[in-house]
């Protein structure tokens, strides 16, 4: 007896598709070994058609795939555009050759069945309506018209022209004629359910001269679309319910044993399990809408249904669409922290993954907002300027080629707590959700800038120092000048080789930046930060105001902007100081300068893919240098 198991008999019709699941024993070897689907020939040889090693035969090209689900110990063979030539004996199996463990599957593909000529077949989906056409001879024009539904013994009236209506069809059935045509009447039945399926007879007149027509009404439950998605990726349910429900509330629900539990609807209901990672977007006036879920979890797998009803809840007899979502744990999307913790006044550096094959794609960071249908306004992007309320405290550092970009947010407040999305205008699966938690700071920040009253005088020399703790000693320190296009790191050089020191004096570790001479363009936000290679750590921000030399004191009170310019986080930082001038770049308006919403995957900015590198030092003529002060006792 084979330990592999699957369906012994599979049948379908031409043009349709099959999805064959094969089950294998739960062992590590089985999970990782080659899976195959082969066709048995008369000689007993089994010819591979598709395998998990990437092999795909010519006859399956463009119409089949094989997906392994190691967490379920199954693999699935999907075959589309079936023809009668696909009828035959197959094996699904495991092993390096086709003589390994296998299971026999018989596939039969038949022609679309012919229907008897005297029966008119209407095929409709659940929730839709049908209009049955009933022709009759002119002599039966004055006679009673009716539609009845066949039961075992009799034909039960649905509706007739004397306005009799079966109770189960009240409000759903209408009998009418069009214009002056006296040779046909129509019966419309709306909000179709499974119970409406069956054989009907429409009749005009009585006795042997009556006109009769047989009708076969097939009411189909929608066939679920199979969606295969990776863990941590995103999925979009595209729901197209038709114009007749365009003005009704829309919903997406997930089926459990007894009911379909609403996950989100357009009336504001949302399942807490999907907080921060779901959006519902009405698309147009034709009843089309989409639901996007990011950060897919194993437990998100299951049967989903979308629909429309004024209550925003599933209702029998209303149109629906269904999906079966599979979540594959063999994910290409790296496992990153989904919760990032910061403290008030501090900073966070969030590493956002993207598809490494799309390094030139535009990168974005948006804040998920749950009000209404949910939306995600873009806060920063490679070609999108930073939103005004984030001035001086938010930047995106693109590191082309390594599959990660970094978003840094400093001067944190408790109002920054919430959900944020990393996304690009490329591969929509690589959309990740991060929850930012902000606690009240309980200690001094790790990085501190002096003087805090940062007002520089035009034409003079101005130095600011960034004090860092010993734990950041080995890390790279940097200063950067912030603009709404990013924070441009100022090139640095060491002033003399680093000296080793037995002790590290907490009070003397600093990196200084000097503006010499100060110009009006030097006014603005500067960040002091630490990083290790491409991994960014803590930052602190300071606003440097520039004013003309006046008689008397050359310093004025610090701007309010510096009140928030401190940082605290358990990460590590860097050391450098600056002189010379920076070439000023005129910012380009980003793709979301006006339309700053990422509401839907498909509608996303497919702008040119030139990547504006917010983290580069291109065009900078300013330099910074590292100074290490050691106190010897």
């Amino acid at each position: 007896k084979s330990p592999i198991f699957g369906p012994q008999e599979v049948s379908s019709i031409e043009g349709d598709s099959v999805s064959i699941t094969c089950y294998y024993p739960d062992t590590s070897v089985n999970r990782h070994t080659r899976k195959y689907w082969c066709r048995q020939g008369a000689s007993g040889m089994c010819t591979t058609l598709i395998s998990s090693n990437g092999y795909l035969s010519k006859e399956y090209s463009g119409r089949a795939n094989l997906i392994n689900f190691p967490e379920n110990n199954t693999f699935v063979i999907n075959i589309e555009q079936l023809t009668q030539d696909d009828t035959g004996s197959y094996k699904c199996g495991l092993g390096t050759s086709n003589r390994g463990l296998s299971f026999d599957v018989s596939l039969e593909v038949s022609q679309v069945p012919e229907l008897p000529s005297d029966t008119h077949v209407y095929t409709k989906d659940i929730g839709r309506n049908v209009t049955i056409e009933c022709p009759f001879k002119r002599e039966n024009a004055p006679s009673k018209k009716s539609l009845c539904k066949k039961t075992n013994q009799s034909c039960e009236l649905v509706i007739d022209s004397t306005e009799k209506v079966n109770p189960s069809y009240i409000g759903r059935a209408k009998l009418f004629m069009k214009g002056t045509d006296l040779t046909v009447f129509y019966v419309n039945i709306s909000h179709l359910t499974h119970n409406d399926a069956g054989l009907y007879i429409c009749q005009a007149g009585e006795g042997p001269s009556a006109d009769k027509k047989n009708v076969d009404l097939q009411v189909l439950a929608p066939e679920p679309e199979l969606l295969y998605k990776d863990l941590r990726s995103s999925v979009t349910f595209e729901c197209d319910l038709g114009r007749e429900v365009a003005n009704e509330a829309k919903y997406l629900c997930r089926m459990n044993k007894e009911t379909c539990d609403v996950i989100i609807n357009t009336l504001g209901k949302r399942d807490p399990d999907f907080e921060g990672r779901i959006l519902i977007t009405p698309k147009d006036d034709n009843g089309r809408f989409s639901v996007l879920i990011t950060g897919l979890r194993k437990e998100d797998a299951g049967h989903y249904q979308c629909g429309a009803h004024s209550s925003g809840l599933p209702q029998e007899g209303w149109p629906i669409q269904t999906w079966q979502l599979f979540v594959n744990e063999e994910s290409t999307i790296p496992n990153r922290r989904s919760v990032v913790k910061g403290v008030t006044g501090g900073s966070v550096a969030i590493a956002c993954p993207y598809n490494p094959k799309e390094s030139s794609s535009l990168k974005y960071w948006c804040r998920w907002e749950g009000d209404g249908n949910g939306h995600c306004p873009v806060l920063v992007g490679t070609q999108a300027q930073v939103q005004e309320e984030y001035e001086g405290r938010l930047a995106l550092f693109d590191q082309p080629g390594n599959g990660t970009y970094t978003v840094i947010l400093n001067q944190l407040t408790t109002e920054d707590a919430g959900f944020y999305w990393c996304l690009t205008n490329g591969d929509s699966r690589w959309r990740t959700t991060i929850e930012l938690q902000v606690a009240e700071a309980t200690r001094e920040p790790n990085l501190e800038v002096t003087p805090q009253n940062a007002t520089a005088v035009l034409g003079e020399t101005f130095t600011v120092s960034c004090h860092y703790p010993c734990k950041f000693y080995s890390q790279e320190k940097y200063w950067c000048k912030w603009s709404n296009k990013g924070c441009h790191i100022l090139p640095s050089h060491d002033e003399g080789a680093r000296q080793s020191s037995v002790s590290c004096d907490q009070s003397s570790q600093l990196v200084s930046m000097t503006l010499n001479p100060v110009s009006k363009e030097d006014e603005g936000w500067y960040w002091c930060g630490v990083k290790q290679g491409q991994t960014y750590g803590e930052t602190t921000a300071i606003y440097i105001a520039v004013e003309e030399r006046t008689r008397g004191s050359s310093h004025v009170n610090p701007t309010d902007a510096n009140a928030r310019a401190k940082v605290a986080l358990e990460e590590e930082v860097v050391d450098s100081s600056i002189s010379e001038k920076e070439n000023k770049a005129i910012p380009n308006p980003g793709p979301f300068a006006n339309e700053r919403e990422i509401q839907n995957v498909g509608d996303q900015a497919q702008e040119n893919r030139a990547s504006g590198d917010a983290g580069s030092a291109d065009g900078q003529s300013r330099s910074s240098s590292s100074k290490h002060h050691h106190h010897h006792h």
Epitope: V10, S12, P222, M255, Q324
Partner: nanobody, 126 residues
Framework: EVQLVESGGGLVQAGGSLRLSCAAS????????MGWFRQAPGKEREFVGA??????????YYEDSVKGRFTISRDNAKNTVPLQMNSLKPEDTGVYFC?????????????????WGQGTLVTVSS
């Protein structure tokens, strides 16, 4: 809610035939799986066969011991899943249950099914 009702059980001689039927009512969906299981006195419920469908495609599964003797099918119009049992043996005796699910799971496992009928007794005498 989905209700399942089995019928067609009874006493039959070895070598004879019986046709069981599982009728489904309530919520129905485009893809569905229904499985037949049997339970002999003092034993665990064991898999007999299953059928699942999606659109025009149908998938049939059988336990090795019944393959070639039992046939599972689906009557669309009546919303039933009959199990035709031929060449019955005394070891086929037991209470036959049908289970239903909307999910794609291993049809051999009782845990795969969300709904169950009350069962119908089949006795095969020698």
């Amino acid at each position: 809610e989905v209700q399942l009702v089995e019928s067609g059980g009874g006493l039959v001689q070895a070598g004879g035939s019986l046709r069981l039927s599982c009728a489904a009512s309530g919520r129905t969906f485009g893809s569905y799986s229904m499985g037949w299981f049997r339970q002999a006195p003092g034993k665990e419920r064991e898999f007999v066969g299953a059928i699942s469908w999606s659109g025009s495609s149908t998938y049939k599964y059988y336990e090795d011991s019944v393959k070639g003797r039992f046939t599972i099918s689906r009557d669309n119009a009546k919303n039933t899943v009959p199990l035709q049992m031929n060449s019955l043996k005394p070891e086929d005796t037991g209470v036959y249950f049908c289970g239903g699910t909307m999910e794609r799971r291993d049809p051999r496992r009782t845990s795969a099914y969300d709904y169950w009928g009350q069962g119908t007794l089949v006795t095969v005498s020698s």
